[in-house]
Each structure stands twice: as structure tokens, then as C-alpha cells.
């Protein structure tokens, strides 16, 4: 039985050219996290595997950095980065948990800084 829940940063916004941390946290389960996949819509961004460490998709290497922890840092943001991001936790023995984050990248310098994981 899957008892865990994924907590995410939810809906967040950031300024064009800036950086943001995408963060998910799995709680309420003793399942072992074997791998976390990060996806943007239909693109695999990065994978963090308990044995193999991080793999960043080559096409995102310049703008995506691993961490902190199982999170993902997006840099040099553009308006095209606006959209849904998913953290997919592969666990044993529970199975798969998925969290969703919506990022809005704003042209303006008055982007709301509501996310506690945001990089200034």
C-alpha cells in the first residue's frame, strides 16, 4: 500500500535570466527512494539515482544543475521555461510517486518571490 505523499514548491514564479530551485519532498513512507526523475512536460531533464548519482540530459547541461539534495536548479531562465515540471520518485517497495510544480518565468522585475526554495 502506498502511504507516502509528495510535497512540492507548488506554483512558483521567477524572473527571466534568474535561477530557481525545483524541490520535492517525499514523506509519510518508509520506502527507499531508488531514483528521482525530473521532467519538463515531455522532456527528461535529469535523473538522480541512489547508486549512479546524477545524470543531466545533454541538451540541458548548460542551464540545469543538480541539487540541492534531490532537487534541481534551473539557471538563465527564459520565458520558454514557463510550464509544468514533474518530480517522479521511484521507490522500493511502494512504487512511483509523482509531484507537480508549475513555474512561471516573468519578463518583469516584479516577479513574486513566494517560493521558499527560490534562489535570490
Amino acid at each position: 500500500m502506498m502511504t507516502g505523499t509528495i510535497e512540492t514548491t507548488g506554483n512558483i514564479s521567477a524572473e527571466k535570466g534568474g535561477s530557481i530551485i525545483l524541490q520535492c519532498h517525499l514523506s509519510s513512507t518508509t520506502a527507499q527512494v531508488t531514483q528521482v526523475n525530473w521532467e519538463q512536460q515531455d522532456q527528461l531533464l535529469a535523473i538522480c539515482n541512489a547508486d549512479l548519482g546524477w545524470h543531466i540530459s545533454p541538451s540541458f547541461k548548460d542551464r540545469v544543475a543538480p541539487g540541492p539534495g534531490l532537487g534541481l536548479t534551473l539557471q538563465s531562465l527564459t520565458v520558454n521555461d514557463t510550464g509544468e515540471y514533474f518530480c517522479i520518485y521511484h521507490t522500493y517497495p511502494d512504487g512511483t510517486y509523482t509531484g507537480r510544480i508549475f513555474l512561471e518565468v516573468l519578463e518583469s522585475s516584479v516577479a513574486e518571490h513566494g517560493a521558499r526554495f527560490q534562489i535570490p
Epitope: 515531455d42 522532456q43 539515482n49 547508486d51 549512479l52 540530459s57
Partner: antibody, heavy 118, light 107 residues
Framework: EVQLLESGGGLVQPGGSLRLSCAAS????????MHWVRQAPGKGLEWVSG????????SYADSVKGRFTISRDNSKNTLYLQMNSLRAEDTAVYYC???????????WGQGTLVTVSS | DIQMTQSPSSLSASVGDRVTITCRAS??????LNWYQQKPGKAPKLLIY???SLQSGVPSRFSGSGSGTDFTLTISSLQPEDFATYYC?????????FGGGTKVEIK
């Protein structure tokens, strides 16, 4: 250099059993998921089974479920496929494969031929 | 199970030609799509993983694109050593499934 060397193939009668082995070297075997993929003569590739890095999780194609068992011994750097109740349609070259991040197959063995025939 | 449909099943081309092979999934597989090359009597070789990432050591004339359900493998300028059979494979969910293959032959 990564190497995967399969063994254990051969001729077996329908209903018989075989145990395939795959000896791995050149990498940290215990860190990688491993899979078996087969190819019938003149046909395409068919996934058979996979196992997680620590052996805790396994999965099978419907065509072999209940007949084949995948296992691994990380202390011996070896992957196994126990094949029971073999059928003519199991005749194929069986490849052992390394699967980083459980997403792509980056290394394949040379394959071992299993022939099921009376 | 996710079905992978590859087309064409075979094609004839000349050295220097641009070759395109397509692969369609029966449901969305995000970018969990890999491409392999196989020559007769040999094990398959990874070309492209995660839809568009070029495997280390593979010539840059090979490229992959697509996401969701539709994917493409392109060989920008076919070389003599590229005549082989190409397979797509999804790793979105088990059972992992392969396309039926595309045999690239010399015209």
C-alpha cells in the same frame, strides 16, 4: 572496459530447462539494473526480463511470466536467467544488457543461442 | 502494453543521403525513447537515448528528436558503415517494447 559475457545456451527439448549466466566486468555491477533481451532467428528484439541493482525488484514479459526467473549475485558480478517449461517459440539469441538509470541499454553482451526443439 | 510502430520497415538509400526513420508510441512516453543500430550477427548498439541525447562515441550525423508519441531518427549523411537495422525502444514502462525495426539497405 565494460564486458558482458553470456553462457549456458544450447539445445533443449520442449518442456526442458536451462539456466543462462552473464558474467559482468569493467564496472560496478551492483550499481546497475540489468535486463535480458532476446531475438528469434531473423526477427526483431524482444525484452524478456529486468532486475533492479539490488535484486529487490524484478519484471517480466507476459510471454515468459511464471516460467522464467531473473536473479543476480552481486558478490559474483553475475546475472542469471532460469528458464523452465521451454517452448519452441523461446528459441532465440539471449542478450544480457546493462541499463543505467533504468532508461537506456548502453552495453549488450554478445548473446547466447537457445534452441528449443525435439 | 505500449506498442511501438516503426516506419518504414525497410528503405534503400545511397551513401550521402539523408535518412529519416520514424517511431510512434501507442501512448505518450514523454522522452523515454531510445534508438539502436544492429548489424548482422552482432549485438545492438546504442545510438540515441532519451529521445535526443547522442550516446558517447556515436558520430554526430545521427540525431534524434520528438516527444510524447512521435519520434524521429535522422542520419544526416549516410555512410557505408551505416547500412544496418535500426530499432526504437520505449523505457517509459514495463514491459519494455521495441519497434519492429527498419532495415537500411544500399540502393
Amino acid at each position: 572496459e565494460v564486458q558482458l559475457l553470456e553462457s549456458g545456451g544450447g539445445l533443449v527439448q520442449p518442456g526442458g530447462s536451462l539456466r543462462l549466466s552473464c558474467a559482468a566486468s569493467g564496472f560496478t555491477f551492483s550499481s546497475y539494473a540489468m535486463h535480458w533481451v532476446r531475438q528469434a532467428p531473423g526477427k526483431g528484439l524482444e525484452w524478456v526480463s529486468g532486475i533492479s541493482s539490488n535484486g529487490g525488484s524484478t519484471s517480466y514479459a507476459d510471454s515468459v511470466k511464471g516460467r522464467f526467473t531473473i536473479s543476480r549475485d552481486n558478490s559474483k558480478n553475475t546475472l542469471y536467467l532460469q528458464m523452465n517449461s521451454l517452448r519452441a517459440e523461446d528459441t532465440a539469441v539471449y542478450y544480457c544488457a546493462r541499463v543505467p538509470y533504468s532508461v537506456w541499454i548502453d552495453y549488450w553482451g554478445q548473446g547466447t543461442l537457445v534452441t528449443v526443439s525435439s | 502494453d505500449i506498442q511501438m510502430t516503426q516506419s518504414p520497415s525497410s528503405l534503400s538509400a545511397s551513401v550521402g543521403d539523408r535518412v529519416t526513420i520514424t517511431c510512434r508510441a501507442s501512448q505518450s512516453i514523454s522522452s523515454y525513447l531510445n534508438w539502436y543500430q544492429q548489424k548482422p550477427g552482432k549485438a545492438p548498439k546504442l545510438l540515441i537515448y532519451a529521445a535526443s541525447s547522442l550516446q558517447s562515441g556515436v558520430p554526430s550525423r545521427f540525431s534524434g528528436s520528438g516527444s510524447g508519441t512521435d519520434f524521429t531518427l535522422t542520419i544526416s549523411s549516410l555512410q557505408p558503415e551505416d547500412f544496418a537495422t535500426y530499432y526504437c525502444q520505449q523505457s517509459y514502462s514495463t514491459p519494455l517494447t521495441f519497434g519492429g525495426g527498419t532495415k537500411v539497405e544500399i540502393k
